[in-house]
Interface confidence: low
């Protein structure tokens, strides 16, 4: 006991009243107002609890302390007074701060600050979004990515810091009166071809495509270096000389020099100039029709085996050459005889008659045009003379069945001699290179010389054999009618065509004549 | 016959930079979009960049933008790839490839394997 | 990371049909034309169809391709030993600024 009557054993936060009791200090309380024992406590009171009388005031928090309290204001807000704490509502002074005043960087870029009652937010700019983990942080809204889909289907959408732009995709422009950017872009195909935005070589045709285009060879030529045709890039050569080249093991200077002329044309050929280079090479076919030189010393094989190469790269140059002519009929003629009749036409369903000096040609211009072939049809008749020498006592080939039957009855015919060449040598072409069986026959009327009276007159044509040379044939072709010295002739097919007068007596009617044409 | 040939590959630490070339032959270079598409090792391909005809049009992936610079020399038949601040993902075979707008990657170089390691 | 969805593996005897599944969504596949790329062994990818089922020359009408709404699949009849390979879809993405995405691969095994 305190000798001056005060317990010292009071708990904490407690005072004593005397030697025997203690008191809780303020803002403590115990079970009991008087403590009369040292195992009571002093319990610190929390005055900001709900059921307390303390009230703060407005726009303010109540903090409990130990043994007391004290009102601060709300974040947010801030006292005018500039008294941190207060006690109660009467000493409340809290007003709302304005942060977007005080600090204006608060949200950052693309963000404006908006005061609130005891706080801020942040409104982004367009094209802008709160970051769901920083809301205060504005971040670019990918309007390509987000589902929107703003822009028209013909372009393509290219986001942007703050916004994005609807493109025309590569190889589109915008539709006339369209912008190029804003979401109402829209977009159509560059048509590159005609807006001469294209990169084709001038060997190729420029195709458009959606979105691009193509260069595909002009008609005549072919893909270069193995590059694919209706490529960017395609480059084409013109495939008519590529093949025409001397015949292997032919030794003729003449020979020789003819096919330079023809390598140098080919050389220096342009589409333009198919005209001009067609006339080129029928006048040096002419002229070494006329004069041979050393081609009339070859053996005879190897000059059925000139001839036989000469008709068939003549009638691929032909063939390829005039697809690049304009529209028209063509007549050339030459010294030694040699006659071109030529006739390009967009497809017309009519038949079509070639006039020639020693012979005429009426076929059905659908057979020109191979289907899908976007180039003109053409249909061409040369007549060349001069060939007769070289094809002269050429061999005459009959199908088995017909040599069978004519070896029975007729012996001596074929075997008194070659069959004589009666008309010109001539040659008939189309744009359509498949002419193996015509859909309709073509009719061809050859004037020749006078027919031997009682020798049997044949309509042939040459057949190119598998070793480069070749020989007269019947097959497909049949004898309409004959005069003495014109004769009509019907075939399923084209190549190149002449009138044979064979060896032997005609009786009055043998059957066998009738087997042969 | 179209021919993409590549050459610039080889080991850098992370942090270095590595310049990828490819020559075109066989084609009209100055024609056609260029690209270069990579693939690390066991993985599949990755687009990385890609840049127009004329240089008109640039565009690359996310993972690579801001560090790696595509450029081409029409003149060369070359295309190139600048590959700076280079990190171990990089690592990786990459390819350049020919390509029409809009379309496919129609050829392809052999590869170029790239190597990021410290 | 890829766009377009792959299976792994497939695994057919020579001789068998097999299907690959590329499946996309409307900002690639959807709103382009797929393209497949064959990848042999240590060699680089190979453009095997494009336009969705047109073949490049030189690739054998074996291997075909469609494409139905946002999915793709090239098939591969009378598989060969040789036609072991990791097969990949490609696309144009119009999410992407000009991006060309790829799908995750598919090893084709021939047992």
């Known amino acids: 006991q305190d000798s001056r009557g005060c317990a010292r054993w009071c708990p904490q936060d407690s005072s004593c009243v005397n030697a025997t009791a203690c008191r809780c200090n303020p803002g403590f309380s115990s079970f009991s107002e008087i403590i009369t024992t040292p195992m009571e406590t002093c319990d610190d009171i929390n005055e900001c609890a709900t059921l307390s009388k303390v009230s703060c005031g407005k726009f303010s928090d109540c903090w409990n302390t130990e043994g007391s309290y004290d009102c601060v204001c709300s974040p947010g807000y801030e006292p005018v007074s500039g008294a941190k704490t207060f006690k109660n509502e009467s000493e409340n002074t809290c007003q709302d701060v304005d942060e977007c005043q005080q600090n204006p960087r608060l949200c950052k870029s693309y963000g404006t600050c908006v005061n609130t009652l005891g706080s801020y937010t942040c409104q982004c700019l367009p094209g802008f979004k709160l970051k769901p983990e920083d809301p205060k942080l504005c971040t670019d809204v990918n309007e390509c990515t987000s589902g929107q889909n703003p822009c028209h289907s013909s372009t393509h959408c290219l986001n942007n810091v703050g916004s994005y732009q609807c493109r025309c995709r590569p190889g589109w422009q915008p539709i006339p009166g369209s912008p190029n950017g804003p979401n109402n872009t829209v977009c159509e195909d560059v048509d590159e071809c005609s807006s001469g935005q294209h990169q084709c070589d001038s060997s190729t045709v420029c195709f458009n495509t959606v979105g691009s285009y193509s260069c595909r060879c002009r008609p005549g030529w072919k893909p270069r270096h193995g590059i694919p045709n209706n490529q960017k890039d395609t480059v084409c050569e013109d495939m008519t000389f590529s093949t025409w080249t001397p015949p292997p093991g032919v030794h003729s200077q003449t020979l020789s020099r003819f096919f330079d002329k023809v390598q140098d044309l080919g050389r220096d050929y342009k589409p333009g100039l198919a005209n001009n280079t067609i006339q080129s090479i029928l006048q040096a076919l002419d002229e070494l029709l006329e004069a041979p030189g050393d081609l009339e010393t070859l053996p005879r094989l190897q000059q059925h085996c000139v001839a036989s190469h000469l008709l068939d790269g003549l009638e691929d140059v032909l063939r390829g050459l005039s697809k690049n002519l304009s529209n028209g009929l063509l007549n050339f003629s030459y010294p030694a005889g040699t006659e071109l009749s030529l006739e390009v036409q967009k497809q017309v369903d009519r038949s079509v008659t070639l006039r020639q000096n020693q012979a005429v040609m009426q076929l059905d211009w659908n057979q020109a045009q191979k289907s899908g072939d976007p180039g003109p049809s053409v249909v061409g008749l040369v007549s060349i003379p001069g060939m007769g020498k070289l094809l002269a006592e050429a061999p005459l080939v009959l199908e088995p069945e017909k040599q069978m039957l004519l070896h029975e009855t007729h012996q001596g015919l074929l075997q008194d001699g070659s069959p004589i060449l009666l008309s010109d040598v001539i040659s008939a072409f189309l744009s359509n290179n498949d002419t193996q069986n015509l859909s309709s026959p073509v009719t061809f009327t050859f004037s020749h010389r006078s027919v031997i009276p009682r020798q049997k007159v044949l309509c042939v044509f040459w057949e190119h054999g598998q070793n480069g040379c070749g020989h007269w044939a019947t097959t497909g072709c049949s004898t309409i009618g004959t005069r003495d010295t014109s004769t009509i002739c019907r075939c399923t097919h084209l190549s190149s065509f002449a009138v044979l007068m064979a060896h032997y007596d005609v009786q009055e009617e043998d059957p066998v004549l009738t087997v042969i044409t | 016959e179209v021919q993409l040939v590549q050459s610039g590959g080889g080991l850098v630490k992370p942090g270095g930079s590595l310049r990828l070339s490819c020559v075109a032959s066989?084609?009209?270079?100055?024609?056609?979009?260029m690209n270069w598409v990579r693939q690390a090792p066991g993985k599949g391909l990755e687009w990385v960049s890609s840049?127009?005809?004329?240089?008109?049009?640039?565009y690359y992936a996310d993972s690579v933008k801001g560090r790696f610079t595509i450029s081409r020399d029409n003149a060369k038949n070359s295309l190139y790839l600048q590959m700076d601040s280079l990190r171990a993902e990089d690592t990786a075979v990459y390819y350049c490839?020919?390509?029409?707008?809009?379309?496919?990657?129609?050829?392809w170089g052999q590869g170029t394997l790239v190597t990021v390691s410290s | 990371q890829s766009v377009l969805t792959q299976p792994p593996s497939v695994f057919a005897a020579p001789g068998e049909k097999v299907t690959i599944s590329c499946s996309g969504s409307?900002?690639?596949?959807?709103?382009?034309?797929v393209s497949w790329y064959q990848q042999l062994p240590g060699t680089a990818p190979k453009l095997l169809i494009y336009?969705?089922?047109k073949r490049p020359s030189g690739i054998p009408d074996r291997f075909s391709g469609s494409k139905s709404g946002t999915s793709a699949t090239l098939g591969i009849t009378g598989l060969q030993t040789g036609d072991e390979a990791d097969y990949y879809c490609?696309?144009?993405?119009?999410?992407?600024?000009?991006?060309?995405?790829f799908g995750t691969g598919t090893k084709v095994t021939v047992l």
């Open positions: 490609g696309t144009w993405d119009s999410s992407l600024s000009a991006g060309y995405v």
């Open positions: 490839a020919r390509r029409e707008y809009g379309g496919p990657f129609d050829y």
């Open positions: 840049i127009s005809s004329s240089s008109s049009y640039i």
């Open positions: 336009d969705n089922n």
């Open positions: 066989g084609f009209i270079f100055r024609s056609y979009s």
């Open positions: 409307s900002s690639n596949i959807g709103n382009d034309y």
